[in-house]
Each structure stands twice: as structure tokens, then as C-alpha cells.
């Protein structure tokens, strides 16, 4: 029986009965917030073999092992994850072992096992046999392994029953509990699963099977399940659903899920039955079950009940995220804010059409309107008094409307009004008239030539770069010395630069009047020698990175014909040289035979150029005789090993309080002070733990149902 669409068992342990007939949970399984310690021994769900999303256990008092509850849970598919995790075991106060001895595969996602004070048998499980990549697993804050003394079956009797694998250079027995080994398939099966008797399953099986080489005997399917058979792809007229099974069109048409209730129903796209058309596609008609590609960004119509939407904060802008057509009027009134330009672009950057008017007033935080980076049409179906559909009043720091070289904006109906925008040049407004097709609509007083641009350098000359030199982390540039009509007006230059992967940045990107600016700024004094060209060395740059650079002349606010003269350069794009890449990440090695090592790694976080190949070096090490000196199977005689990393147990410090130079050969020594990098890593780790815990609490604490 398939159970779904996600099962949440909380408060009352008897709700576990809901799992009685489930073989597959299509969705997640939450077992949480059961504060009264119960006896779970009478609860056993041997039918449950697959969870298609994730398993979350949180604060279940009295539960000591999962093995009795779910003895046959074989696969957690991770089709949807809980904060990147397919298995989360968090704050399980009484859990002593995981015990999921039939768990063979976590198809997607990692595991997070944290703050389980009594939990052992963690180091005896080889998660690499279950997951593709173990590097994202997070196993922290559980019972210290030293206090566990985990012993696999038969070890005490010196008749070990479990198989060995290598984890972190430690070759050891692998088990789930004191009497359950971790199952491993013969190497002859390769990536295939196997039966309890070690016979290889059909290639389409995942986890296990009841008979060898039979696609109808799989416990779970590697790809898709249809009519009792595991298939590599869904047959004709059936569609992939929830990442694991094939359904017909009728099933897909009839789905009414809590998650999709507001939508127009599920769609069939690219052989899959899904909740919505994927990114870049739209329904082929409002009630269609099929998707077609969007031309440009997919339309999303947003409507304001009160006709006029006031944007006075990031929060109000957030409501417009993803909107491409706004039915109504926009009133923008941003007086202050942090990182406002990029936040507004994030939430309003997709708007293409406004059906009413756009009014920008008292928005002293704005330097540019480029955050409306896709606005192409103002219909002006509703207009302000005086028939204005674009109204810009009293914006003390507004310097740019849009980059008119790369912008097509049409105002279909209505006039424009501009007043009291002291840094907005009238030439910029006139340019907008031409582009938008409103030229001739405005009357004389609609664009005030005296109080717009009165405090801006509106007649700009162009500065030209004369030379550029690059190294791996430096750029040297020089430019022509600017000579204003009166040389005393020139004070200095300001160089603006930033990383620019693409050649599409503008001067006003990410800039607002409250100090946020995506550009780095450096002041450059005039060279005392009038014949020397000004220049600068930009250092501390990243290797093999493209930067955008431009220069502005800083001039006295000399007014000439009512306007200030100024000068600035075009934006120059320049790439630093390549350099040595950082080290490859997550290097793991394991032996799969007596004469082979398998080494895996992830690419470096900073390639610093185009990677062409890796060099792998290895050398033989002498065997550590220390390993043979003790009987590790004897539970009481595990020696405390002295690691050569400078850290020791507190007990040992009290015995021998002498301090030695770190790294010395003379015995115990103090821990070396943490490096800045280590401190930073610890800080990030603590932050990450908090973020996860907040996510957990926000996800699971919900209002009580009626």
C-alpha cells in the first residue's frame, strides 16, 4: 500500500498505527514531539520499505532504536529533502542506536544526526555504502565514541560476523547494532543490489530483492515502478510521478493536493506529471495540462486589490517577486534602506508591464531606477490627476533613470512629470521622452529645467584609458589627464571597480544613496607633474577573474550655464591572469582489493583559471606496528591513543601539567592557538547549526488543527 502525501506523527505515539499497512510512503515521514516516554516494542512496521522523500525524527522520548519500528526500511529516495537532508535524527534523547539494518540506499541528500546524547553505533556504519557522497553528512553532538565502546556482532567471542571496510583510513567491522551487521553485496554484483543470500538482483532493483535477477522481485526500484515491475523509463501513455512511479493521465488530471490547491492542477511535461510547468515554460492555455516554452521570462500577473501598490520598503517589494505584469499603479517611496537597490532588483526586476501609472516621490534612497530592469511598457490605463502616467517628484539623489542605450520603454498613454530631482540631468529626461514616445505630450511645466539637475555634473566629458597591465592579482591602469576649462576645478579622480563575470554592468548597479554600492572605490590624487598621466595599481584581486573598471573626475561644483561640468570614462572590462588553483577538496581514498586504491575528490573551490588535469601522487607507508599491540575486541581495554595533533584529554593535562613547545617529541603539550581560519570555520559552523535549528523549528511547529 502506498501511503501519502507525507505522514506527520506527533504528540501521540499511537498515531504510529497509521503506518500499519504502508509499504511505500510517498512523501516524508515525521515522527516528532512525543514527550511522554512510551514502550515502542509493540509497534513494528515490517511492511514499510521505501520513503520517497525524507525521514525526520525529533524529540521522541523513550525510543531507543529504529530497528524494531522499521526492520525492512531499505530506501530513502530523497526526492524532496529537509534542508538538504534525507535522514534527520535530532535531539532524540533516548535513542541508543539507529538500527536500520536493512537501509541500503539514500538516493539523494545527506544525513544529519545531531544532539542525540545517548546515540552510539555511528562510527560503525559505513555511510558510503548507502549514500553516493558522504562529504555533506553532519554527525555532531552525539555520545562520544569513546564512551560507546561499540562492538559489532561476534567481536567479543573473537568470531566476527560482519564485513570490514575502510573509513578515514580505519579498516573496521561494519554494523548497526550489537547484533546486526551492515549488509554488503558481493563485489561481483557491482552497483547492483543483492538478496539476503548474496545473489545479485536485477539491475533495475534498488536496495534489495526477494529473488535474483527478477525485475518484479525488487524491494525498491532504481528508476521507476509500474504495474509491479521496475522499469528504466515509464511506458507510453504513463508519466513519471514523485520521482519513483509511473501514473496515467487521468491520475495526474485528478490530483488535488494541499500543496497545489491554488494552482490550475498538475501538468504533464517532458514525460512527467508535475505540480507546475518548470522554469521557462507556461501552460498552453489556462486549463491545459501541457506546457509550452515562454518567450522571454514566463508571465506572472500580479494584481493589487487597492489598485495602487506602495513600495516603501523591501518587505512591500517582496510581494512582487516573480511578477512580470503588474495590474495597477506603482507608487515608489523609498526614503531609506540597507542594500536597497539590489533588494529592489531582486523583487521587482522581472516586472515588464505596469497597466496603470508609475509614481516615484520622496525616494531619497534611490540613485537609479535600473532596479526595474525589465520594465518595457507603462500602459497608463489609469493616470494621475493632470493625465500623468510617469511622475517623478522630489528624489534628492536620483541620478539615472535607465541606461537608455540598452533599454526600450514605451509609455502608451499619459504624460511625464519631473520636478525637484536635483541630481537628475534634464538631458536624461529628454532622452526618456524620445525613447518612450512621449515627446510632444508634455507641456512646458511638466519638466522643470531649473530644479532638475541643479546639483549634478550634467555635461560630462569622456576620460580615456591609456594603458592596462595585469598580473594574477593586480591591475595597473592609466588614463588621460582631464583638463577642465579651469584646471583648478579638478580635485582628484575616483576609480570604481568590481568583479563582473559578464560584460553587462552599469554604473548604478547595486548603488543607493544610503551607502550601499556594489562598486569598490579608490581615490586617486592628481600627479604633481602635469605631464604624468594619472593611474592606479589595484591589488588584492582574484586570479582569472574579470573586473569592470571606470574612472570619474572629482570636480568643484562649478556652475557653467546653470550646469556643472564633469568627466568620466566608459566601463572597461579586464581579466586578471591565471594562477595556481587551490587544493582539491574532500579527498577520500578506499581500498577495494589487495592491490587497488580508489581515490575520489571534488574540484578546488578556487580553480584560478581553466583546469586541464590533476596530478595524483602516492607513496607506500610503513605499517603502524601500534595497531597490533592491543586486543581491540576487548571492550574494557581500549587504550587512549595519543594523537600527534597537539590536542589531548583534560584528564591527561591534570596528570602532567608541564607545557612544552608545540610539536615537540617530549610528551603532552598545550593545544596550539587556533588560527584565524580555524576560528572563522568554527564561527561558520556555529552559524550553520543555528540556521538549521531555526529551519527545523519553523518547519515543524505549526498551529494546532481545528
Amino acid at each position: 500500500e502506498i501511503c501519502g502525501p507525507g505522514i506527520d506523527i506527533r504528540n501521540d505515539y499511537q498515531q504510529l498505527k497509521r503506518l500499519e499497512n504502508c509499504t511505500v510512503i510517498e512523501g516524508y515521514l515525521h515522527i516528532l514531539l512525543i514527550s511522554k516516554a512510551e514502550d515502542y516494542r509493540s509497534y513494528r512496521f515490517p511492511k514499510l520499505t521505501v520513503i520517497t522523500e525524507y525521514l525526520l525524527l525529533f524529540r521522541v522520548a523513550g525510543l531507543e532504536s529504529l530497528g524494531d519500528l522499521f526492520p525492512n526500511l531499505t530506501v530513502i529516495r530523497g526526492w524532496k529533502l529537509f534542508y538538504n537532508y534525507a535522514l534527520v535524527i535530532f535531539e532524540m534523547t533516548n535513542l541508543k542506536d539507529i538500527g536500520l539494518y536493512n537501509l541500503r540506499n539514500i538516493t539523494r541528500g545527506a544525513i544529519r544526526i545531531e544532539k542525540n546524547a545517548d546515540l552510539c553505533y555511528l562510527s560503525t556504519v559505513d555511510w558510503s555504502l548507502i549514500l553516493d557522497a558522504v562529504s555533506n553528512n553532519y554527525i555532531v553532538g552525539n555520545k562520544p565514541p569513546k564512551e560507546c565502546g561499540d562492538l559489532c556482532p561476534g567481536t567479543m567471542e573473537e568470531k566476527p560476523m560482519c564485513e570490514k571496510t575502510t573509513i578515514n583510513n580505519e579498516y573496521n567491522y561494519r554494523c548497526w547494532t550489537t547484533n546486526r551487521c551492515q549488509k554488503m553485496c558481493p563485489s561481483t554484483c557491482g552497483k547492483r543490489a543483492c538478496t539476503e543470500n548474496n545473489e545479485c538482483c536485477h539491475p533495475e532493483c534498488l536496495g534489495s530483492c526477494s529473488a535474483p535477477d527478477n525485475d518484479t522481485a525488487c524491494v525498491a526500484c532504481r528508476h521507476y515502478y509500474y504495474a509491479g515491475v521496475c522499469v528504466p523509463a515509464c511506458p507510453p501513455n504513463t508519466y513519471r510521478f514523485e520521482g519513483w512511479r509511473c501514473v496515467d493521465r487521468d491520475f495526474c488530471a485528478n490530483i488535488l493536493s494541499a500543496e497545489s490547491s491554488d494552482s490550475e492542477g498538475f501538468v504533464i511535461h517532458d514525460g512527467e506529471c508535475m505540480q507546475e510547468c518548470p522554469s521557462g515554460f507556461i501552460r498552453n492555455g489556462s486549463q491545459s495540462m501541457y506546457c509550452i516554452p515562454c518567450e522571454g521570462p514566463c508571465p506572472k500577473v500580479c494584481e493589487e486589490e487597492k489598485k495602487t501598490k506602495t513600495i516603501d520598503s523591501v518587505t512591500s517589494a517582496q510581494m512582487l517577486q516573480g511578477c512580470t505584469i503588474f495590474k495597477g499603479n506603482l507608487l515608489i517611496n523609498i526614503r531609506r534602506g540597507n542594500n536597497i537597490a539590489s533588494e529592489l532588483e531582486n523583487f521587482m526586476g522581472l516586472i515588464e508591464v505596469v497597466t496603470g501609472y508609475v509614481k516615484i516621490r520622496h525616494s531619497h534612497a534611490l540613485v537609479s531606477l535600473s532596479f526595474l530592469k525589465n520594465l518595457r511598457l507603462i500602459l497608463g490605463e489609469e493616470q494621475l490627476e493632470g493625465n500623468y502616467s510617469f511622475y517623478v517628484l522630489d528624489n534628492q539623489n536620483l541620478q539615472q533613470l535607465w541606461d537608455w542605450d540598452h533599454r526600450n520603454l514605451t509609455i502608451k498613454a499619459g504624460k511625464m512629470y519631473f520636478a525637484f530631482n536635483p541630481k537628475l540631468c534634464v538631458s536624461e529626461i529628454y532622452r526618456m521622452e524620445e525613447v518612450t514616445g512621449t515627446k510632444g505630450r508634455q507641456s512646458k511645466g511638466d519638466i522643470n529645467t531649473r530644479n532638475n539637475g541643479e546639483r549634478a555634473s550634467c555635461e560630462s566629458d569622456v576620460l580615456h584609458f591609456t594603458s592596462t597591465t595585469t598580473s594574477k592579482n593586480r591591475i595597473i591602469i592609466t588614463w588621460h589627464r582631464y583638463r577642465p576649462p579651469d584646471y583648478r576645478d579638478l580635485i582628484s579622480f575616483t576609480v570604481y571597480y568590481k568583479e563582473a563575470p559578464f560584460k553587462n554592468v552599469t554604473e548604478y548597479d547595486g548603488q543607493d544613496a544610503c551607502g550601499s554600492n556594489s562598486w569598490n572605490m579608490v581615490d586617486v590624487d592628481l600627479p604633481p607633474n602635469k605631464d604624468v598621466e594619472p593611474g592606479i595599481l589595484l591589488h588584492g584581486l582574484k586570479p582569472w577573474t574579470q573586473y569592470a573598471v571606470y574612472v570619474k573626475a572629482v570636480t568643484l561644483t562649478m556652475v557653467e550655464n546653470d550646469h556643472i561640468r564633469g568627466a568620466k570614462s566608459e566601463i572597461l572590462y579586464i581579466r586578471t591572469n591565471a594562477s595556481v588553483p587551490s587544493i582539491p577538496l574532500d579527498v577520500l581514498s578506499a581500498s577495494n582489493s589487495s592491490s587497488q586504491l580508489i581515490v575520489k575528490w571534488n574540484p578546488p573551490s578556487l580553480p584560478n583559471g581553466n583546469l586541464s588535469y590533476y596530478i595524483v601522487r602516492w607513496q607506500r607507508q610503513p605499517q603502524d606496528g601500534y595497531l597490533y599491540r592491543h586486543n581491540y575486541c576487548s571492550k574494557d581495554k581500549i587504550p587512549i591513543r595519543k594523537y600527534a595533533d597537539g590536542t589531548i584529554d583534560i584528564e591527561e593535562v591534570t596528570e602532567n601539567p608541564k607545557t612544552e613547545v608545540c610539536g615537540g617529541e617530549k610528551g603532552p603539550c598545550c593545544a596550539c592557538p587556533k588560527t584565524e581560519a580555524e576560528k572563522q570555520a568554527e564561527k561558520e559552523e556555529a552559524e550553520y547549526r543555528k540556521v538549521f535549528e531555526n529551519f527545523l523549528h519553523n518547519s515543524i511547529f505549526v498551529p494546532r488543527p481545528e
Epitope: 512523501g27 488530471a253 488535488l256 493536493s257 494541499a258 500543496e259
Partner: antibody, heavy 117, light 112 residues
Framework: QVQLQESGPGLVKPSETLSLTCTVS?????????WNWIRQPPGKGLEWIGY???????NYKPSLKDRVTISRDTSKNQFSLKLSSVTAADTAVYYC??????????WGQGTLVTVSS | DIVMTQSPLSLPVTPGEPASISCRSH???????????LQWYLQKPGQSPQLLIY???NRLYGVPDRFSGSGSGTDFTLKISRVEAEDVGVYYC?????????FGQGTKVEIK
């Protein structure tokens, strides 16, 4: 894989309240769909009574609205029908059924309720 | 309530012959979203109803192609191109476009 099972007394006295429960297995009633009651008097046609939705809102047949209540117990994954002031005309086979976005896809096997003194 | 009227109420048929059932509503059952939620169900003796056709003309996966649905607005028809013995039972039309949902009175199909 989704199963619905009606349960309740087979005999109810006139003027009393008829109470039936539908136990759902294989799907959480809060996860989606509309959970309906439909009845069929002996030898007659089907009559839709009403539903409770996955988020707990109700819709009833107007002519029964004053007498009918459909509620749910999410912890047991059950929904219930209560029909008050019953008469012989309420004698019928009562079905619970799941309705999706378009149609009824799963039905219980039905339970006969007789109203008689 | 929208009343769904079926005709005939009884339909004796010969195996291999075609059959047709009509269902009329006294007002349009087109939903505001443009869809017409008109279904046809078959109830075999002693069983719960089972779906045959949804949204006027969509045959449910697994239903034999001798069944077809058609119509629009207020007039709808279920056709069986060649009746087989297993097709006996009561056929109901049902509308789910507007609450309250309603069934037709049913058409009993039996073999002559």
C-alpha cells in the same frame, strides 16, 4: 492503494441522529482531496450529501444543510457524517468517496443504514 | 440545484448493438474556468460506482474504447458502440461544476 471503509450502526430510530465514520488508509486526509458522503436509497439513484476538504472546509447539499454535519479526526485519519432528525426517507446505503480536482476516484464499499423504530 | 435529467431510464440492449444515453441539465454546467465537469459512472449490481468518462469526453485509462462521451453546455451523451454482457448496470451522469453537485436519476442497461 487508497482504501475507504464506512462504519457505524446499521439501524437508527426515527428522529435520532445517524452517525457514520469513514476510515481512510493509504492517504492522509489533510494532504489533499475532498472527502465526500453519498447515499443511495434502496432501488433508487445516487445522491451527493456533501464533503469536507483537506483543510477542513465543508460543502453540503442545500436541502440537507440544516441536518448534516461532516467533521474529521486527523489523528485517526477519519471523517464522519452526522445526520440529525432522521426519518424513513433517510434509509439508504451510505458511501464515502474521495473526489479530486475532477472526479471521484475511490469509493468505500457502502454501508446500509435503516431508519426504523 | 442543477437538475440532471437522464433518458431513457431503462435501456434493454442486444449484445453487439450500439447504445446511447442522454443527460441534460436545465442550465449550463460550464465552470468559470472554462471546463465542464461532467462525468459518467457505472454501478454494477452489488458494487460501488466506477468512473467511465470525465470532463465530458475523456475516457478513463483502462476503460474499453467502445465507451465514448460527447456534448457541451447542457446536452451530453454516453455512447457504447457495441454492447457486451459485462456492460450491464446503472449508468449515472454527474456534474461537479457548481456546488451542489448532482447525479442524474440513472439509466438501467440490461441485456434483452
Amino acid at each position: 492503494q487508497v482504501q475507504l471503509q464506512e462504519s457505524g450502526p446499521g439501524l437508527v430510530k426515527p428522529s435520532e441522529t445517524l452517525s457514520l465514520t469513514c476510515t481512510v488508509s493509504g492517504y492522509s486526509i489533510t494532504g489533499g482531496y475532498l472527502w465526500n458522503w453519498i447515499r443511495q436509497p434502496p432501488g433508487k439513484g445516487l445522491e451527493w450529501i456533501g464533503y469536507i476538504s483537506y483543510h477542513g472546509t465543508n460543502n453540503y447539499k442545500p436541502s440537507l444543510k440544516d441536518r448534516v454535519t461532516i467533521s474529521r479526526d486527523t489523528s485517526k485519519n477519519q471523517f464522519s457524517l452526522k445526520l440529525s432528525s432522521v426519518t424513513a426517507a433517510d434509509t439508504a446505503v451510505y458511501y464515502c468517496a474521495r473526489h479530486g480536482r475532477v472526479f471521484f476516484d475511490y469509493w468505500g464499499q457502502g454501508t446500509l443504514v435503516t431508519v426504523s423504530s | 440545484d442543477i437538475v440532471m435529467t437522464q433518458s431513457p431510464l431503462s435501456l434493454p440492449v442486444t449484445p453487439g448493438e450500439p447504445a446511447s444515453i442522454s443527460c441534460r441539465s436545465h442550465q449550463s454546467i460550464v465552470h468559470s474556468n472554462g471546463n465542464t465537469y461532467l462525468q459518467w459512472y457505472l454501478q454494477k449490481p452489488g458494487q460501488s460506482p466506477q468512473l467511465l468518462i470525465y470532463k465530458v469526453s475523456n475516457r478513463l485509462y483502462g476503460v474499453p474504447d467502445r465507451f465514448s462521451g460527447s456534448g457541451s453546455g447542457t446536452d451530453f451523451t454516453l455512447k457504447i458502440s457495441r454492447v457486451e454482457a459485462e456492460d450491464v448496470g446503472v449508468y449515472y451522469c454527474f456534474h461537479g461544476s457548481h456546488v451542489p453537485w448532482t447525479f442524474g436519476q440513472g439509466t438501467k442497461v440490461e441485456i434483452k
